[in-house]
């Protein structure tokens, strides 16, 4: 069948069909209804909401829905143990302890099961000792403390501010610095934007609010037992000491009030800028130690959290494509939350739900996508990204051979300000025409394209007339498939305005505030930016699922290849003796990108010109587009981190958050002048220019005439 | 030597608003917090809330706003809906180390018809 | 909120008297307690900070000791300047909150 026999309903009114379909007033209905109680991974609130969504999908008309279960490793505190922090005097009495809850919001009182603030994986511990403060404990900041200052935080518990990089880096970072537990607090300069009111008044975070989340450094790897491999019922796990990721020294999260009791007696060093500076009224004394009359006072940490193996469940979606069901696009979010996910992951869920509604009434009327489309609700994202990695571990030789796209359906909103995309170049283009379609919400651009406002309010930093799409880091569900696997992905959602909000995130991110009501009265009260994104994330699934020739254009890939590489070559630049006594030469990596981009434009010209009517000729084409990205992974992976494989991009060493480019030629390069072996540093630098080469080299020819 | 220098008396009608001003020099206006307490007529001392951002007593919880001008040190004290008993000397401390070492010289607020 | 609980609420003594005045809270403050004398037309003025250490130019007649619930402040030998209302403030918990006052009166 072609694709146009597999429907009842004309192809160019199938996009309009499903659009038109989706409904503000049920992503608001779905998400009140998902965030009612708590549903934290691993608890039998989670499981329920996944039996019920599995029962809605299938009333929705999808060909099967499955739960697929993992018994993987995951964190609580003690019940009966709370996790605290103290201020103690000389003598060991507790003349301070931090909050052991958040107040909870108006009209969840009494709700049970709302998990105290922690962070997940943390060791159990109770060391004491004096403060250090670490800024926001990036890498630069322990540069700037060890190397500039001269302050030592071995022995020490440093107390950093969230915000700016993941806050398992601000562990990791930490426990190379020799601390020996760490707090992690929310600044307001960061978490409260001025002139907004704390919630319940407002979307700010109030001085009792905390931001709980996993301390991981996992690199990829899924369950911290079984790293490649499924968590199954036959899985052969690690001991506990030999897991993957796990913090190594205790750490635990606090609100701006409680900080303010440790901070304000600060001693020591005073801050080296205004750039260590928060909003709290207190010095920002880097320390170590309290001041003057404090100075026999230290702070002592109380952890008894404790790691385990839990059983976690994915709710898996099918809808059975007409023409090419071998061929997967898959749309998945997660459902697990810290608290009532009211943002973090409901606001995506909702949507999520409303795309199945959507897709679910076409096919009710006879409707078929081309291509078989898979719908996820992941487990334990929270957790390390466990329901989504594991699943993909346990179906990856399925995945890289029928993989065309993943589409992350997290939070759909973190602002109402403008659209916000991650994403392969391959899929600028569908995001530019798919944009350029949909109608935009914002104030001010009634009758006007959602691509005119985006590239308005968020305008490329290179292309004017463009939007700004930004490179997929990590830190969320996508990791997997992009970053191990090379499926082409994508993430879209509605974001603030990052020029007059300087904050991290949004102020209730992981807090118990994080409301159904947060949303409805304050973010989207009339749900036009959910609508807006679910049909950017729908449509984007649509097109991929639908459209004959796959809408990727390699083009993209060729113009970004040329500017990573030449960003990589000026860093290396810095450093002219070092390159020409080592004889660092870039001339193979642009060489491999001009032979690329001349490929990929020969290759854009046979895709005008090939016959669509021939059905063997198109399967080869998409596949050519389909494989691009797997073309990217290098088996062996990058040095240190196996799975992460992709060659052009890695999340940021630094920062999980972030997407790097060249990531191997870049960390080899990465304060390359402290290194006390620059003949071997060098070396290696060399070496990943190699790798970087031949990769882009070899994908370029996967695009070649393949005869 | 710090010192906190409050704007002048004040007579209110029942209903309106008075917004007290408190200058702060001598020390870094940004590392500490600024206070208001407030003592009526013969009374005990009754603190009106403070810290960073702001933290209201609950008793004056959405008719009190305190505000601060960092470029000019200067922090600010709005109380709303007045009534006869908010009749009081209204008094700037600064916060450090979670007390109030340094006040200003109070400012008496009379409310009458 | 925390109750501050001061006793006596007046007291009458002596030049040269030991005066001792009490402060209790009620749930734990740990050392977040604060004690100010007040004059009549005058502020305030701090006088013991975290329970017992004096702040700076205070005399040191004066000291401050307790943590958790109870807490006392002491005057070891009364001068003619100390005749005044003496206040404790709990600054623990994010709304502080004063003991309702001591008036030491000469006898």
């Known amino acids: 069948k072609s694709s146009n026999e597999a429907t009842n309903i004309t192809p160019k009114h199938n996009m309009k069909a499903f659009l038109d379909e989706l409904k503000a007033e049920n992503i608001k209905k779905f998400l009140y209804n998902f965030t009612q109680i708590p549903h934290l991974a691993g608890t039998e609130q989670n499981f329920q909401l996944a039996k019920q969504i599995q029962s809605q999908w299938k009333e929705f008309g999808l060909d099967s829905v499955e739960l697929a279960h993992y018994d993987v490793l995951l964190s609580y505190p003690n019940k009966t143990h709370p996790n605290y922090i103290s201020i103690i005097n000389e003598d060991g009495n507790e003349i301070f302890n931090t909050s052991l809850f958040e107040p909870p919001p108006p009209g969840y009182e009494n709700v049970s099961d709302i998990v105290p603030p922690f962070s997940a994986f943390s060791p159990q511990g109770m060391p004491e000792g004096d403060l250090v403060y670490v800024n926001y404990a990036r890498t630069e900041d322990f540069f700037k403390l060890e190397r500039d200052m001269k302050i030592n935080c071995s022995g020490k518990i440093v107390i950093a501010r969230y915000g700016k990089v993941f806050r398992g880096n601000k562990v990791k970072n930490a426990q190379l610095a020799g601390a020996k537990g760490v707090i992690l607090y929310s600044d307001p300069a960061d978490y409260f934007a001025p002139g907004v009111k704390s919630y319940p008044d407002g979307w700010n975070l109030p001085g009792g609010g905390v931001q709980r989340g996993n301390i991981l450094n996992l690199n990829g790897a899924g369950d911290p037992l079984t790293p490649g491999y499924p968590a199954n019922e036959y899985a052969y796990r690690r001991g506990i000491a030999e897991a993957v990721g796990l913090p190594s020294i205790p750490v635990h999260p606090i609100g701006y009030y409680d900080a303010q009791k440790l901070l304000e007696k600060m001693g020591g060093s005073a801050p080296p800028d205004s750039s260590w500076r928060g909003s709290l009224k207190v010095p920002y004394n880097v320390g170590p130690g309290f001041t003057g009359n404090f100075s026999t006072q230290k702070v002592k940490m109380h952890i008894h959290s404790t790691n385990e193996v839990t059983r976690i469940y994915n709710v898996i979606g099918t809808l059975r494509g007409a023409v090419e069901p071998d061929r997967y696009v898959i749309l998945g979010g997660h459902r697990d939350s810290w608290v009532f996910g009211g943002i973090d992951p409901q606001s995506g869920a909702a949507v999520v739900h409303e795309i199945v509604r959507s897709f679910g009434t076409l096919k009710k009327e006879g409707w078929r996508p081309r291509r078989t489309i898979l719908f996820a609700s992941w487990d334990a994202e929270e957790f390390g990204l466990l329901g989504s990695t594991e699943w993909a571990e346990e179906n990856s030789r399925l995945l890289q051979e029928r993989g065309v796209a993943y589409i992350n359906a997290d939070s759909s909103i973190e602002g109402n300000y403008t659209l916000r995309v991650d994403c392969t170049p391959l899929m600028y283009s569908l995001v530019h025409n798919l944009t350029k379609e949909l109608k935009s919400p914002d104030e001010g651009f009634e009758g006007k394209s959602l691509y005119e406002s985006w590239t308005k309010k968020s305008p490329s930093p290179e292309f004017s007339g463009m939007p700004r799409i930004s490179k997929l880091g990590s830190g969320n569900d996508f990791e997997v498939f992009f970053q191990r696997l090379g499926i082409a992905s994508g993430r879209a959602r509605y974001t603030k305005n990052w020029e007059t909000n300087k904050f991290s995130g949004y102020p209730l991110y992981h807090s118990v505030y994080e409301t159904y009501e947060l949303v409805e009265k304050f973010y989207d009260p009339m749900f036009k930016y959910h609508l807006t994104v679910a049909q950017v994330r729908g449509g984007m699934v649509f097109e991929l699922a639908n459209s004959i020739v796959l809408p990727f254009d390699c083009r993209d890939y060729a113009v970004v290849l040329r500017k990573y590489a030449d960003k990589i070559y000026s860093i290396s630049m810095k450093h002219p003796q070092e390159m020409k006594t080592y004889s660092v030469s870039f001339d193979s990596l642009f060489s491999a990108v001009k032979n690329f981009t001349e490929i990929a434009s020969k290759f854009s010209e046979r895709l005008q010109d090939f016959d669509k009517s021939n059905p063997i000729v198109l399967r080869m084409m998409n596949d050519q587009l389909m494989f691009l990205e797997r073309a990217f992974i290098d088996p062996l992976g990058l040095p240190d981190r196996p799975f992460y494989r992709h060659v052009i991009y890695a999340p940021s060493s630094h920062n999980k958050y972030a997407g790097e480019s060249f990531p191997g030629i870049y960390d080899a390069l990465f304060d390359i002048e402290s290194k006390v072996d620059p003949s071997k540093a060098w070396g290696e630098v060399k070496r990943q220019i190699y790798v970087a080469a031949f990769t882009v080299q070899a994908a370029a020819e996967t695009l070649s005439e393949v005869a | 030597q710090v010192q906190l220098v409050q704007s002048g008396a004040e007579v209110k009608k029942p209903g309106s608003s008075v917004k007290v001003s408190c200058k702060a020099s001598g020390d870094s206006f940004s590392n500490y917090g600024i206070s208001w307490v407030r003592q009526a007529p013969g009374q005990g001392l009754e603190w009106m809330g403070g810290f960073t951002p702001v933290n209201y007593a609950q008793k004056f919880q959405g008719r009190v706003t305190i505000t601060a001008d960092e470029s000019t040190s200067t922090a600010y004290m709005e109380l709303s809906s007045l009534r006869s008993e908010d009749t009081a000397v209204y008094y700037c401390a600064r916060d450090r180390w979670s007390s109030f070492d340094y006040w200003g010289q109070g400012t008496l607020v009379t409310v009458s018809s | 909120d925390i109750q501050m609980t001061q006793s006596p609420s007046s007291l009458s003594a002596s030049v040269g008297d030991r005066v001792t005045i009490t402060c209790r809270a009620s749930q734990n403050i740990g050392s977040y307690l604060n004690w100010y004398q007040q004059k009549p037309g005058k502020a305030p003025k701090l006088l013991i900070y975290a329970a017992s250490i004096l702040q700076s130019g205070v005399p040191s007649r004066f000291s401050g000791s307790g943590s958790g619930t109870d807490f006392t402040l002491t005057i070891s030998s009364l001068q003619p300047e100390d005749f005044a209302t003496y206040y404790c403030?709990?600054?623990?918990?994010?709304?502080?909150?004063f003991g309702q006052g001591t008036k030491v009166e000469i006898k």
């Open positions: 403030l709990q600054s623990y918990s994010t709304l502080w909150t």
